[in-house]
Interface confidence: low
Protein backbone atom coordinates (compact mmCIF):
# COMPACT_ATOMS: atom_id res chain seq x y z
CA UNK A 1 0.00 0.00 0.00
CA UNK A 2 2.47 2.52 1.07
CA UNK A 3 4.88 1.80 -2.63
CA UNK A 4 1.06 2.00 -4.04
CA UNK A 5 0.64 5.28 -2.80
CA UNK A 6 3.72 6.82 -3.45
CA UNK A 7 3.21 6.16 -7.06
CA UNK A 8 0.13 8.61 -7.16
CA UNK A 9 1.18 10.75 -4.67
CA UNK A 10 5.13 11.61 -4.81
CA UNK A 11 4.91 14.31 -2.05
CA UNK A 12 4.28 11.22 0.22
CA UNK A 13 8.06 10.30 0.17
CA UNK A 14 8.80 14.00 1.60
CA UNK A 15 9.74 13.86 5.04
CA UNK A 16 9.40 15.74 8.24
CA UNK A 17 11.91 19.10 7.45
CA UNK A 18 11.14 19.48 3.50
CA UNK A 19 8.27 20.31 1.69
CA UNK A 20 6.93 18.87 -1.27
CA UNK A 21 7.50 21.55 -3.77
CA UNK A 22 4.93 22.05 -6.61
CA UNK A 23 6.69 24.57 -8.80
CA UNK A 24 9.65 22.36 -8.74
CA UNK A 25 7.93 18.64 -10.07
CA UNK A 26 6.79 18.11 -6.43
CA UNK A 27 10.66 17.51 -5.56
CA UNK A 28 11.22 17.38 -1.49
CA UNK A 29 12.63 20.74 -1.25
CA UNK A 30 13.99 21.60 2.39
CA UNK A 31 12.33 24.19 4.46
CA UNK A 32 13.44 27.83 4.46
CA UNK A 33 15.39 29.59 7.40
CA UNK A 34 12.68 30.11 10.02
CA UNK A 35 10.25 27.86 8.42
CA UNK A 36 9.22 23.50 9.84
CA UNK A 37 7.94 20.77 9.28
CA UNK A 38 7.07 18.23 11.16
CA UNK A 39 5.65 15.31 9.34
CA UNK A 40 6.13 14.12 6.31
CA UNK A 41 4.08 14.92 3.05
CA UNK A 42 3.67 18.36 3.91
CA UNK A 43 2.98 20.70 0.85
CA UNK A 44 4.40 23.89 2.76
CA UNK A 45 6.39 24.29 5.53
CA UNK A 46 4.99 26.70 8.65
CA UNK A 47 6.45 29.82 9.49
CA UNK A 48 8.89 29.14 13.00
CA UNK A 49 7.42 30.87 16.15
CA UNK A 50 9.64 33.71 17.41
CA UNK A 51 9.70 34.66 20.96
CA UNK A 52 9.90 37.92 21.02
CA UNK A 53 8.79 41.01 23.51
CA UNK A 54 7.80 39.18 27.10
CA UNK A 55 8.96 35.92 25.29
CA UNK A 56 12.03 34.09 25.56
CA UNK A 57 13.00 31.00 23.90
CA UNK A 58 13.03 28.11 25.78
CA UNK A 59 13.95 25.64 22.58
CA UNK A 60 14.83 27.07 19.48
CA UNK A 61 13.33 26.29 15.43
CA UNK A 62 14.80 23.69 13.80
CA UNK A 63 13.60 22.34 10.21
CA UNK A 64 11.45 19.61 12.15
CA UNK A 65 9.92 21.14 14.74
CA UNK A 66 8.57 24.44 16.15
CA UNK A 67 10.20 27.33 18.66
CA UNK A 68 9.19 26.85 22.01
CA UNK A 69 9.19 30.15 24.20
CA UNK A 70 8.95 30.39 27.65
CA UNK A 71 8.29 34.20 29.15
CA UNK A 72 11.43 36.37 30.95
CA UNK A 73 11.74 37.12 34.39
CA UNK A 74 9.00 39.08 36.17
CA UNK A 75 6.34 36.72 34.08
CA UNK A 76 4.84 33.03 33.73
CA UNK A 77 3.21 31.33 30.82
CA UNK A 78 -0.28 30.87 30.66
CA UNK A 79 -2.56 29.03 27.87
CA UNK A 80 -1.46 25.80 25.74
CA UNK A 81 2.47 25.83 24.68
CA UNK A 82 3.03 29.45 26.38
CA UNK A 83 0.38 31.48 24.36
CA UNK A 84 0.27 33.88 27.05
CA UNK A 85 3.02 35.63 29.69
CA UNK A 86 0.97 36.60 32.51
CA UNK A 87 3.02 39.23 35.09
CA UNK A 88 4.14 37.91 38.64
CA UNK A 89 2.83 39.40 41.59
CA UNK A 90 4.45 38.83 45.07
CA UNK A 91 3.58 36.36 47.27
CA UNK A 92 0.39 37.54 49.23
CA UNK A 93 -0.71 39.13 46.13
CA UNK A 94 -2.98 38.26 43.31
CA UNK A 95 -3.25 39.94 39.72
CA UNK A 96 -6.27 41.87 39.28
CA UNK A 97 -6.95 44.35 35.99
CA UNK A 98 -5.26 47.09 38.28
CA UNK A 99 -1.84 45.09 38.67
CA UNK A 100 -1.20 43.01 41.78
CA UNK A 101 -3.12 43.45 45.08
CA UNK A 102 -3.01 41.86 48.28
CA UNK A 103 -4.84 39.27 49.39
CA UNK A 104 -7.81 40.50 51.28
CA UNK A 105 -7.87 39.04 55.32
CA UNK A 106 -8.56 35.98 55.88
CA UNK A 107 -6.96 34.83 52.44
CA UNK A 108 -3.78 33.91 50.99
CA UNK A 109 -1.55 32.78 48.64
CA UNK A 110 1.88 31.79 48.30
CA UNK A 111 2.89 31.55 44.99
CA UNK A 112 3.62 34.27 42.84
CA UNK A 113 1.19 33.47 40.51
CA UNK A 114 -2.92 32.47 40.84
CA UNK A 115 -5.25 33.62 43.13
CA UNK A 116 -5.65 34.55 46.54
CA UNK A 117 -7.61 31.29 48.21
CA UNK A 118 -9.60 31.80 51.66
CA UNK A 119 -7.59 30.25 54.89
CA UNK A 120 -8.83 26.43 55.92
CA UNK A 121 -11.52 26.33 58.44
CA UNK A 122 -9.87 24.15 61.36
CA UNK A 123 -12.77 23.94 62.92
CA UNK A 124 -14.89 22.44 59.84
CA UNK A 125 -12.57 19.08 60.88
CA UNK A 126 -12.89 19.92 64.96
CA UNK A 127 -9.33 21.68 65.08
CA UNK A 128 -8.34 24.32 66.66
CA UNK A 129 -6.25 27.00 64.93
CA UNK A 130 -2.28 26.14 65.77
CA UNK A 131 -0.84 28.90 63.79
CA UNK A 132 -2.34 31.91 62.57
CA UNK A 133 -2.39 32.42 58.58
CA UNK A 134 -1.21 35.37 56.67
CA UNK A 135 -1.50 36.67 53.32
CA UNK A 136 1.27 34.15 52.01
CA UNK A 137 0.55 31.25 54.14
CA UNK A 138 -2.57 29.35 54.79
CA UNK A 139 -3.55 28.55 58.97
CA UNK A 140 -1.59 25.38 60.91
CA UNK A 141 -4.20 23.19 62.25
CA UNK A 142 -3.23 22.12 65.01
CA UNK A 143 -4.63 19.08 67.36
CA UNK A 144 -8.83 19.68 68.64
CA UNK A 145 -8.92 21.17 72.14
CA UNK A 146 -10.12 17.88 73.55
CA UNK A 147 -6.95 15.76 72.14
CA UNK A 148 -5.00 18.48 74.42
CA UNK A 149 -6.75 17.25 77.84
CA UNK A 150 -4.49 15.50 80.57
CA UNK A 151 -5.91 12.21 80.12
CA UNK A 152 -5.48 12.20 76.27
CA UNK A 153 -2.96 9.29 75.29
CA UNK A 154 -1.68 11.07 71.79
CA UNK A 155 -1.56 13.91 70.26
CA UNK A 156 -3.14 14.21 67.06
CA UNK A 157 -0.83 15.38 64.19
CA UNK A 158 -1.79 18.21 62.52
CA UNK A 159 -3.94 17.87 59.45
CA UNK A 160 -1.90 17.92 56.25
CA UNK A 161 -3.06 21.29 54.53
CA UNK A 162 -5.04 21.67 51.70
CA UNK A 163 -4.53 20.90 47.98
CA UNK A 164 -4.13 23.81 46.07
CA UNK A 165 -7.05 25.22 44.96
CA UNK A 166 -9.51 23.46 47.43
CA UNK A 167 -11.22 25.87 49.69
CA UNK A 168 -13.26 24.71 52.30
CA UNK A 169 -16.92 23.79 51.53
CA UNK B 1 2.66 57.62 21.19
CA UNK B 2 0.92 54.16 20.22
CA UNK B 3 -2.03 54.97 17.39
CA UNK B 4 -4.10 53.10 15.82
CA UNK B 5 -5.92 54.73 12.72
CA UNK B 6 -8.94 52.74 10.81
CA UNK B 7 -10.29 53.79 7.65
CA UNK B 8 -12.53 51.89 4.65
CA UNK B 9 -16.16 51.33 6.33
CA UNK B 10 -19.20 52.21 4.83
CA UNK B 11 -22.58 51.39 3.46
CA UNK B 12 -22.33 47.74 1.87
CA UNK B 13 -25.54 45.86 0.72
CA UNK B 14 -25.93 42.19 2.03
CA UNK B 15 -23.93 39.80 0.53
CA UNK B 16 -21.82 42.58 -0.17
CA UNK B 17 -17.73 42.99 0.42
CA UNK B 18 -15.66 45.56 2.47
CA UNK B 19 -11.88 45.71 3.18
CA UNK B 20 -10.88 47.45 6.90
CA UNK B 21 -7.53 48.75 7.20
CA UNK B 22 -5.72 49.44 10.69
CA UNK B 23 -2.65 51.90 10.95
CA UNK B 24 -0.24 51.66 13.53
CA UNK B 25 2.58 53.68 14.11
CA UNK B 26 4.59 54.26 17.47
CA UNK B 27 5.37 50.88 18.44
CA UNK B 28 7.26 47.72 16.82
CA UNK B 29 3.90 46.97 15.16
CA UNK B 30 5.40 43.27 14.27
CA UNK B 31 6.03 42.14 17.89
CA UNK B 32 2.43 42.57 18.54
CA UNK B 33 -0.82 40.44 17.93
CA UNK B 34 -3.59 42.10 16.77
CA UNK B 35 -7.02 41.32 16.64
CA UNK B 36 -10.33 42.64 15.36
CA UNK B 37 -13.68 43.19 17.34
CA UNK B 38 -16.91 44.78 16.69
CA UNK B 39 -19.93 46.25 18.63
CA UNK B 40 -23.73 46.32 17.62
CA UNK B 41 -26.04 48.78 19.41
CA UNK B 42 -27.05 47.65 22.97
CA UNK B 43 -24.40 44.20 23.04
CA UNK B 44 -21.07 43.87 24.31
CA UNK B 45 -17.87 44.04 22.40
CA UNK B 46 -17.62 40.55 20.04
CA UNK B 47 -14.23 39.04 19.11
CA UNK B 48 -14.06 38.93 15.51
CA UNK B 49 -10.70 37.44 15.05
CA UNK B 50 -6.80 37.38 15.73
CA UNK B 51 -3.50 37.15 13.72
CA UNK B 52 -0.37 36.41 15.12
CA UNK B 53 2.14 38.49 15.26
CA UNK B 54 4.18 37.46 12.12
CA UNK B 55 0.76 36.21 10.34
CA UNK B 56 1.98 32.54 11.20
CA UNK B 57 -1.18 31.84 13.15
CA UNK B 58 -5.12 32.54 13.56
CA UNK B 59 -8.22 32.42 15.35
CA UNK B 60 -11.75 33.36 14.54
CA UNK B 61 -15.12 33.58 15.96
CA UNK B 62 -17.09 30.79 14.37
CA UNK B 63 -19.89 33.61 13.32
CA UNK B 64 -17.47 35.30 10.66
CA UNK B 65 -15.50 32.04 10.05
CA UNK B 66 -15.21 31.47 6.09
CA UNK B 67 -16.15 34.90 5.37
CA UNK B 68 -13.74 37.24 7.14
CA UNK B 69 -10.15 37.05 6.40
CA UNK B 70 -7.93 38.66 8.59
CA UNK B 71 -3.75 39.80 6.93
CA UNK B 72 -1.33 42.12 7.99
CA UNK B 73 1.52 43.84 6.15
CA UNK B 74 4.05 44.43 8.55
CA UNK B 75 6.51 46.53 6.42
CA UNK B 76 3.34 49.02 6.22
CA UNK B 77 2.68 48.60 9.92
CA UNK B 78 -1.40 48.06 8.75
CA UNK B 79 -3.71 45.41 9.76
CA UNK B 80 -6.46 44.82 7.28
CA UNK B 81 -9.77 42.72 7.63
CA UNK B 82 -11.68 41.40 4.39
CA UNK B 83 -15.23 41.11 4.75
CA UNK B 84 -16.53 38.60 2.55
CA UNK B 85 -20.19 37.90 2.16
CA UNK B 86 -21.87 40.12 4.14
CA UNK B 87 -24.91 39.77 6.36
CA UNK B 88 -27.44 42.30 7.96
CA UNK B 89 -26.19 41.07 11.44
CA UNK B 90 -22.52 42.48 10.73
CA UNK B 91 -23.86 45.64 11.08
CA UNK B 92 -21.79 47.34 14.24
CA UNK B 93 -18.78 49.54 14.72
CA UNK B 94 -15.81 47.17 13.98
CA UNK B 95 -12.42 48.00 15.99
CA UNK B 96 -8.92 46.92 15.61
CA UNK B 97 -6.90 46.02 18.51
CA UNK B 98 -3.12 45.37 19.90
CA UNK B 99 -2.66 42.36 21.83
CA UNK B 100 -0.87 43.14 25.57
CA UNK B 101 2.68 41.14 26.02
CA UNK B 102 0.60 39.52 28.82
CA UNK B 103 -3.01 38.93 30.07
CA UNK B 104 -5.09 37.02 32.43
CA UNK B 105 -7.95 36.47 30.50
CA UNK B 106 -8.39 34.52 26.97
CA UNK B 107 -7.02 35.28 23.44
CA UNK B 108 -10.80 36.71 22.49
CA UNK B 109 -11.59 38.52 25.50
CA UNK B 110 -11.87 42.53 25.04
CA UNK B 111 -9.15 43.22 28.51
CA UNK B 112 -6.17 40.80 26.11
CA UNK B 113 -6.28 43.97 24.37
CA UNK B 114 -4.03 47.50 25.13
CA UNK B 115 -4.57 49.91 22.47
CA UNK B 116 -8.01 50.27 20.37
CA UNK B 117 -8.51 51.86 16.72
CA UNK B 118 -11.46 54.67 16.79
CA UNK B 119 -13.42 52.32 15.09
CA UNK B 120 -15.48 52.20 11.58
CA UNK B 121 -18.78 51.58 11.03
CA UNK B 122 -19.79 49.39 8.88
CA UNK B 123 -23.79 48.78 7.72
Known amino acids: FERTRSLQDPCSNCPAGTFCDNNRNQICSPCPPNSFSSAGGQRTCDICRQCKGVFRTRKECSSTSNAECDCTPGFHCLGAGCSMCEQDCKQGQELTKKGCKDCCFGTFNDQKRGICRPWTNCSLDGKSVLVNGTKERDVVCGPSPADLSPGASSVTPPAPAREPGHSPQ | QVQLVQSGGGLVQPGGSLRLSCAAS????????MAWFRQAPGKEREFIGR????????DYADSVKGRFTISRDNPKNTLYLQMNSLKPEDTAVYYC???????????????????WGQGTQVT
Open chain 2, 97 to 115: ARQRSYSRYGIRAPQTYDY
Open chain 2, 51 to 58: LAWNGGST
Open chain 2, 26 to 33: GWAFDNYG
